[in-house]
């Protein structure tokens, strides 16, 4: 997260980290006791899922292995459209005050809505500095028309843009798959942005979760 600050303790109980061994790979969100939602570009063969603590490496955190993951069938490694994936935990997460399910959206929030993006990704770019504590930054949703003015043909349907004019505030490497939460519901998953991160007036691009609630629910049902 660029130009952010540590999240208020326990304010993101649905936030998870996907680890490769002990190393941060991506962010994600807990959908229910068995399922994590993340970005399709975060695909690995096996995951260790960190839940229940804002601090990576915290011994009190839950750590659950996951071996099965289901990318959206329309995901493209070329255009990064449909950049979402469900990861099935090998054992159930224990819900608590620090481990809660995210609220999936029942509607798409409009441009101008203030949202929070969070993650353990690098706080500097292009040189990397990985924080141990979960970082947050507030950004505003940007209309597809305004975002297309910036990214032209790089932008596809079901991609959502967010940022702050003339500001560096943005997600970055390591935040991928993590949540963009607006008015208490999950509206985006960190997908991509300009590198180095934090170029002023280059918004962050997110997978627009409100367009995929049916696929999310159908996929969890299908692979119960």
């Amino acid at each position: 997260i660029i130009d952010g600050a540590p999240c208020a303790r326990g304010s993101h109980p649905w936030q998870v980290a996907l680890l490769s061994g002990n190393q941060l790979h991506c962010g994600g969100v807990l959908v229910n006791e068995r399922w994590v939602l993340t970005a399709a570009h975060c695909k690995m063969n096996e995951y260790t899922v960190h839940l229940g603590s804002d601090t990576l490496g915290d011994r009190r955190a839950q750590r659950i292995k996951a071996s099965k993951s289901f990318r959206h069938p329309g995901y493209s490694t070329q255009t990064h459209v449909n950049d979402l994936m469900l990861v099935k935990l090998n054992s159930q997460a224990r819900l608590s005050s620090m481990v809660k399910k995210v609220r999936l959206p029942s509607r798409c929030e409009p441009p101008g809505t203030t949202c929070t993006v969070s993650g353990w990704g690098t706080t500097t770019s292009p040189d990397v500095t990985f924080p141990s504590d979960l970082m947050c930054v507030d950004v505003k949703l940007i209309s597809p028309q305004d975002c297309t003015k910036v990214y032209k043909d790089l932008l596809e349907n079901s991609m959502l843009c967010a940022g702050i004019p003339d500001s560096k505030k943005n997600a970055c490497n390591g935040d991928s798959g993590g949540p963009l939460v607006c008015r208490g519901t999950l509206q985006g998953l960190v997908s991509w942005g300009t590198f180095p991160c934090g170029q002023p007036n280059d918004p962050g691009v997110y997978t627009q979760v409100c367009k995929f609630t049916k696929w999310i629910n159908d996929t969890m049902k299908k692979h119960r």
């Epitope: 292009p126 990214y151 032209k152 790089l154 970055c172 490497n173 300009t194 590198f195 002023p200």
Partner: antibody, heavy 122, light 107 residues
Framework: QVQLQESGPGLVKPSQTLSLTCTVS??????????WNWIRQHPGKGLEWIGS???????YYNPSLKSRVTISVDTSKNQFSLKLSSVTAADTAVYYC??????????????WGQGTLVTVSS | DIQMTQSPSSLSASVGDRVTITCQAS??????LNWYQQKPGKAPKLLIY???NLETGVPSRFSGSGSGTDFTFTISSLQPEDIATYYC?????????FGGGTKVEIK
Amino acid sequence: QVQLQESGPGLVKPSQTLSLTCTVSGGSISSGGYSWNWIRQHPGKGLEWIGSIYRSGSTYYNPSLKSRVTISVDTSKNQFSLKLSSVTAADTAVYYCARAKQLTLTRYFDYWGQGTLVTVSS
Amino acid sequence: DIQMTQSPSSLSASVGDRVTITCQASQDIANYLNWYQQKPGKAPKLLIYDASNLETGVPSRFSGSGSGTDFTFTISSLQPEDIATYYCQQASQLPFTFGGGTKVEIK
């Protein structure tokens, strides 16, 4: 189809400043998600990235050349430029301008100019 | 800086042969690895990006694989027009760096 064209003097005297301009057509230099780069190739040798500039004006330089390099952009003319000061014979090379798709997920040089040979000699 | 070690520096093969070039990064670069073809007197041309994605319009006989530190570029059936120098390039960190190149010739 994006096209890039380098222009500038082919001969520069030692200790002077090498100046090149890259004119972009078929695409806007102010598009987000791309960087505009200078890369050079010494005669018979490999490729060396010199530096890049973004639509925002942010610049990034190779540390090995940083003290001598300035890259600037003129969005109104859809051009970007390279200045390399205090040149020596070791700066004799073919200089390429190139566009990079440069995202957190993917980064590569997709369009290149044809290159211009700059010789440093008195 | 990340060092890119490419091998071999040159090779000679017959038309129709399978040609393999390797590239090793001095540290983990995930899949931020690209391959370019350069013909004499011309600018480099992108063939493969993100280690394994074929650039639009590039023949399918070209392919790439690998992640982390070890990468491979393959021409499944060498054609006369493939005579060129091939470069790998890492895009994980600035400054972006290139391998030393592999010159491919026809026997």
